[in-house]
């Protein structure tokens, strides 16, 4: 008799998930000698233990604590780059500006980036067919809880000037419902963080508007100011030129506004 299986609205676990997580852990320790003390088998066992045999709508931050402990990592607290709805450019930036870090440049972020996973209550199986969708099914699913947990910890670690890259092409440049808007903004520590500097990335070539005056940016400024953190904002009119100038700051064209 075939066992009844819950059908969720979201895509199932990424194929070859265990191997992918293990492979990423190996690669990360290869690239980052300071993390060679990390036991990748223990990391995978802790990752799996966070969601296997548990109802995928009943995952808690506590479930991920063993993994968080194993993945503890010190990044320079004044070199943190947050992002919202513009991940690719943020990652391109930190690949060039090697002393700055997005969450996905840390071990735990690197392990899980772009992956989906979930289990089933009372079975040791990974569900490759479907996983809960945050909106249609439940918010306390394995993927959402993971990102909420690591994002909170990442924001809590930040100090001095924290940068955030925002997508100027979106209708809501700052979205209160994004991970940045709902988790990271509220977990920056005012006693450590002096300034949040937003970089608003323009999409159109001819777009010369000052998107720092956008109502959603003003809303962000208000939230941040109420938390006793200073706020500043810069328009990045030409993201392609911006990246080029990060690579080659001596270039003569890099003195003008980007």
């Amino acid at each position: 008799v075939p066992r009844w299986r819950q059908q969720w609205s979201g895509p199932g676990t990424t194929k070859r998930f265990p191997e992918t997580v293990l492979a990423r852990c190996v690669k990360y320790t290869e690239i980052h000698p300071e993390m060679r003390h990390v036991d990748c088998q223990s990391v995978w066992d802790a990752f799996k233990g966070a969601f296997i045999s548990k109802h995928p709508c009943n995952i808690t931050e506590e479930d991920y604590q063993p993994l968080m402990k194993l993945g503890t990592q010190t990044v320079p607290c004044n070199k943190i780059l947050l992002w919202s709805r513009i991940k690719d450019l943020a990652h391109q930036f930190t690949q060039v500006q090697r002393d700055m870090f997005t969450l996905e440049d840390t071990l735990l972020g690197y392990l899980a980036d772009d992956l989906t996973w979930c289990g089933e209550f009372n079975t040791s199986k990974i569900n490759y067919q479907s996983c809960p969708d945050w909106r249609k099914d439940c918010s306390n699913n394995p993927v959402s809880v993971f990102w909420k947990t690591v994002s909170r910890r990442f924001a809590e670690a930040a100090c001095d000037v924290v940068h955030v890259m925002l997508n100027g092409s979106r209708s809501k440049i700052f979205d209160k419902n994004s991970t940045f808007g709902s988790v990271e903004v509220h977990n920056l520590q005012p006693e450590k963080v002096q300034t949040l500097e937003a970089w608003v990335i323009h999409g159109g070539r001819e777009d010369s508007r000052d998107l720092c005056q956008d109502p959603t940016i003003k809303e962000l400024e208000s939230i941040i100011s109420k938390r006793n953190i200073q706020f500043s904002c810069k328009n990045i009119y030409r993201p392609d030129k911006f990246l080029q100038c990060v690579k080659n700051p001596e270039d003569s064209s890099c003195t003008s506004e980007i």
Partner: nanobody
């Protein structure tokens, strides 16, 4: 270029001991899980024992549990297998292998050496 070079095989009497070694080069040894696998004459490959990249976790097939001990030295890029209380059915070519790790009974292997022959016979 990844190289895994096994040594220490030979002829040993039942009940005897042998220590196999594997010298690794061409990759960052301390990042990889390592295993010993074996192939008896006319049989398929059998996973024997494994160790995680830092050495914290060790694993053994039921057939060798309590008799074999796996260890590694990340400062020397070496993997060892101490084989005690050897039996005739331990006769096989023993291979050193590097990989990502395990999920349950699945070993995710990347590279394997050429092997060393262990013969247990009186």
């Amino acid at each position: 270029e990844v190289q895994l070079l096994e040594s220490g095989g030979g002829l040993v009497q039942p009940g005897g001991s042998l220590r196999l070694s594997c010298a690794a080069s061409g990759f960052i040894f301390s990042s990889y899980a390592m295993s010993w696998v074996r192939q008896a004459p006319g049989k398929g490959l059998e996973w024997v024992s494994g160790i995680s990249n830092t050495g914290i976790n060790t694993y053994y097939a039921d057939s060798v549990k309590g008799r074999f001990i796996i260890s590694r030295d990340n400062s020397k890029n070496t993997l060892d297998l101490q084989m005690n209380s050897l039996r005739a059915d331990d006769t096989a070519v023993y291979y050193c292998a590097s990989g990502k790790g395990w999920d349950g009974n699945t070993w995710y292997e990347d590279y394997r050496g050429q092997g060393t022959l262990v013969t247990v016979s009186s």
